[in-house]
Interface confidence: medium
């Protein structure tokens, strides 16, 4: 779109609570540091300048792009050198390399103290004495903890934090109405903030064909009643939300997904038939309702695919006509036709057919050599079907903490290069598949699990990019996106590894660890169990099960003590040495 | 090469019907939403209907609705237009035209029309 | 009658540039990329000249430009020659139907 001036374009249709909002988001995710008060003071500058443009597109500076006048404003921070170190060389560079090198120091680890969640009278308090700066607060938090956030659905999350806050600071028992939503919100928010980190990643590391391959098979699946014409219009105008806001376009990323909202609801008819409610909502209730709406039912009367895809003599024509088209379509009518499926087999599938394709369609006898494509992807299909049932079955057995820690000895063993932290957070959140997906019936489980797999290990690529310390880290996150999980599953314990030095202070524990909550408690103790597999990576599951019962005993019986310091100092040393013992160390 | 040839047009009285035939080549037919778009004498271009690429979906401008029927038939590479109730304001040059592999975008291959002239 | 207005003609000598303007709504022109350009010359089909607003139809010259700004369209043909004496149309999406402008002549002169 041309326009005189982009940001009173922007401004104009989003209003100025939204253009408020997602600027303070923008600046919040690429100047991860900053305090608070500098980017409300920085907002509030875009804003004015904004509205100067809005009553006068002519007026001076108002023709420059969005990038130009964010990037100029985010240059003007004092401290950027001394607060950022090299991101600072940024600001020497012209657009579009400034934005470029913002984008490439965006940390998704930054170092920000942990959120403490304060007394509910304190937030209340806080909430009624000025509303805006609270909600303002919040945004911020969380963009600057989570930069690849998806900005428009963090206004949503922002209504909702909004909303919990106007009911139960007027409710009787204001902590039980409230702790809960702010759980809720938590743990939605972190699950979001991950899917969307996989969108970006798929775009920036595996190209726009990657993205458009996946939009295309998980719509299909969603909307198995369309046109391939309309999932394709679709995934084109999917492509260009996310592209924009992982690009830091927020504010162009929020007016072209209230446009795609817009012209879904419109041709409902033609897309899918569990539209409605969502349709009926305001606009980001409508965005986040349609983002998450269930599969619509299958039309009854769906051909055989082989038909199209295998049998018919002009299979190699219609491919060599138009390569990434035939291959949608076949992506398109496969998805459609299995939503039991994850999206990233049928991404597979697809790729096993076009790489059959491109080998049978030079052959002498194209239609002999691809014949059989379909025999294929039995092997495909099985070995992610039979993973599930392993691993739900060891679930029902174990429950979600035991289910969690058998994984982080395995993936300890796979990479223990990897810092304990990330392995820990990986690792437990790769434990709640169990729960997420194994209640699920069969034809749910994979697209459930398996792609929830490919959003936690995704969190792992991201954090080891970072810091690289595993060749077959990096081997398995770079290779190709739909194999990752096949490409970790596959890893057997890592022989060149040499044991971490055995170190006293890091399994001695303080009374500290009784005021904490069941959550942190655990963490606790797995950090310590993955540290026991660094030091031991050769000890077996029941030499390591010992060692964490007498570990879980010790703490118990110590938090019960009434010289609680002096009974972890004490037994602690014991524990130490009984675990030594142990395991041979 | 894209051809698109039309068909089927002629003189025919008010009230009357005519079937209008869009016989396509030189590419995948059944990939294309199909376009009939109209030109009167001396006058601008007015869409007509559209059709997607399976046949499922039909649009229609609101002067023909309810009186033109498009369709299609991907086996015969074919793109059909049913007019009845005719009257003198349809009176036109009409194009098929084929659009891309989505709703919107731009028509980009067009046939060389077929003269409908509905007088008495 | 149209629903998307245009200029009735507008003319140029050759070497020079002309705009031709398409004025919609926030329904049409205004809403999401969906504006098309055409070339129609005497006697001839209509030629897709732009696409998704200012996208160039393959084998169309670079001297053909399109842009957008709020619910106008505008279609920019530089270094005028004779052969570019024909009637440009625009189109645009609009709720499930496609919508034409009147038509703008251009006259070389």
């Known amino acids: 779109d041309a326009h005189k001036s982009e940001v009173a374009h922007r401004f104009k249709d989003l209003g100025e609570e939204n253009f408020k909002a997602l600027v303070l988001i923008a600046f919040a995710q690429y100047l991860q540091q900053c305090p608070f008060e500098d980017h409300v003071k920085l907002v509030n500058e875009v804003t004015e300048f904004a509205k100067t443009c809005v009553a006068d597109e002519s007026a001076e500076n108002c023709d420059k792009s969005l990038h130009t006048l964010f990037g100029d404003k985010l240059c003007t921070v004092a401290t950027l050198r001394e607060t950022y170190g090299e991101m600072a060389d940024c600001c020497a560079k012209q657009e579009p390399e400034r934005n470029e090198c913002f984008l490439q120091h965006k940390d998704d680890n930054p170092n920000l103290p942990r959120l403490v969640r304060p007394e509910v009278d304190v937030m209340c308090t806080a909430f009624h004495d000025n509303e805006e700066t609270f909600l303002k607060k919040y945004l911020y938090e969380i963009a600057r903890r989570h930069p690849y956030f998806y900005a428009p659905e963090l206004l949503f999350f922002a209504k909702r934090y909004k909303a919990a806050f106007t009911e139960c600071c007027q409710a009787a028992d204001k902590a039980a109405c409230l702790l809960p939503k702010l759980d809720e919100l938590r743990d939605e928010g972190k699950a979001s903030s991950a899917k969307q980190r996989l969108k970006c990643a798929s775009l920036q590391k595996f190209g726009e064909r990657a993205f458009k391959a996946w939009a295309v098979a998980r719509l299909s699946q969603r909307f198995p009643k369309a046109e391939f014409a309309e999932v394709s219009k679709l995934v084109t105008d999917l492509t260009k939300v996310h592209t924009e806001c992982c690009h830091g376009d927020l504010l162009e990323c929020a007016d072209d997904r209230a446009d795609l909202a817009k012209y879904i609801c419109e041709n409902q008819d033609s897309i899918s038939s569990k539209l409605k409610e969502c349709c009926e909502k305001p606009l980001l209730e409508k965005s986040h309702c349609i983002a998450e709406v269930e599969n619509d039912e299958m039309p009854a009367d769906l051909p055989s695919l082989a038909a199209d895809f295998v049998e018919s003599k002009d299979v190699c024509k219609n491919y060599a006509e138009a390569k990434d088209v035939f291959l949608g379509m076949f992506l398109y009518e496969y998805a459609r036709r299995h939503p039991d499926y994850s999206v990233v087999l049928l991404l597979r599938l697809a790729k096993t057919y076009e790489t059959t394709l491109e080998k049978c369609c030079a052959a002498a006898d194209p239609h002999e050599c691809y014949a059989k494509v379909f025999d294929e992807f039995k092997p495909l299909v099985e070995e992610p079907q039979n993973l599930i049932k392993q691993n739900c079955e060891l679930f029902e057995q174990l429950g979600e903490y035991k289910f969690q820690n058998a994984l982080l000895v395995r993936y300890t063993k796979k990479v223990p290069q990897v810092s304990t932290p990330t392995l820990v957070e990986v690792s437990r959140n790769l434990g709640k598949v169990g729960s997420k997906c194994c209640k699920h019936p069969e034809a749910k489980r994979m697209p459930c699990a398996e792609d929830y797999l490919s959003v936690v290990l995704n969190q792992l690529c991201v954090l080891h990019e970072k810091t690289p310390v595993s060749d077959r880290v990096t081997k398995c996150c770079t290779e190709s996106l739909v194999n990752r999980r096949p490409c970790f599953s596959a890893l057997e314990v890592d022989e060149t590894y040499v044991p971490k030095e055995f170190n006293a202070e890091t399994f001695t524990f303080h009374a500290d660890i009784c005021t904490l909550s069941e959550k942190e408690r655990q963490i606790k103790k797995q950090t310590a169990l993955v540290e026991l597999v660094k030091h031991k990576p050769k000890a077996t599951k029941e030499q390591l099960k010992a060692v964490m019962d007498d570990f879980a005993a010790f703490v118990e019986k110590c938090c019960k003590a009434d010289d609680k310091e002096t009974c972890f100092a004490e037994e602690g040393k014991k524990l130490v040495a009984a675990s030594q013992a142990a395991l041979g160390l | 090469q894209v051809q698109l040839v039309e068909s089927g047009g002629g003189l025919v009285q008010p009230g009357g019907s005519l079937r209008l035939s869009c016989a396509a080549s030189g590419f995948t037919f059944s990939y294309y939403w199909m376009y009939w778009v109209r030109q009167a004498p001396g006058k601008g271009l007015e869409w007509v209907s559209a059709i997607d690429t399976r046949g499922g979906s039909t649009y229609y401008a609101d002067s023909v609705k309810g009186r033109f029927t498009i369709s299609r038939d991907n086996a015969k590479n074919t793109l059909y237009l049913q007019m009845n109730s005719l009257k003198p304001e349809d009176t036109a040059l009409y194009y098929c035209?084929?659009?891309?592999?989505?709703?919107?975008?731009?028509?980009?291959?067009w046939g060389q029309g077929t003269q409908v002239t509905v007088s008495s | 009658q149209a629903v998307l207005t245009q200029p009735p003609s507008v003319s140029g000598s050759p070497g020079k540039t002309v705009t031709i303007s398409c004025a919609g709504t926030s329904s049409d022109v205004g809403y999401g990329n969906y504006v098309s350009w055409y070339q129609q010359l005497p006697g001839m089909a209509p030629k897709l000249l732009i696409y998704d607003v200012s996208k160039r139809a393959s084998g169309i010259t670079d001297r053909f430009s399109a842009s957008k700004s709020g619910n106008t369209a505008s279609l920019t043909i530089s270094g005028l020659q004779s052969e570019d004496e024909a009637d440009y149309y625009c189109?645009?999406?609009?709720?499930?139907?496609?919508?034409f402008g009147g038509g703008t002549h251009l006259t070389v002169l």
């Open positions: 035209a084929r659009g891309g592999l989505v709703r919107v975008g731009g028509l980009g291959s």
């Open positions: 189109a645009s999406y609009r709720s499930g139907t496609t919508v």
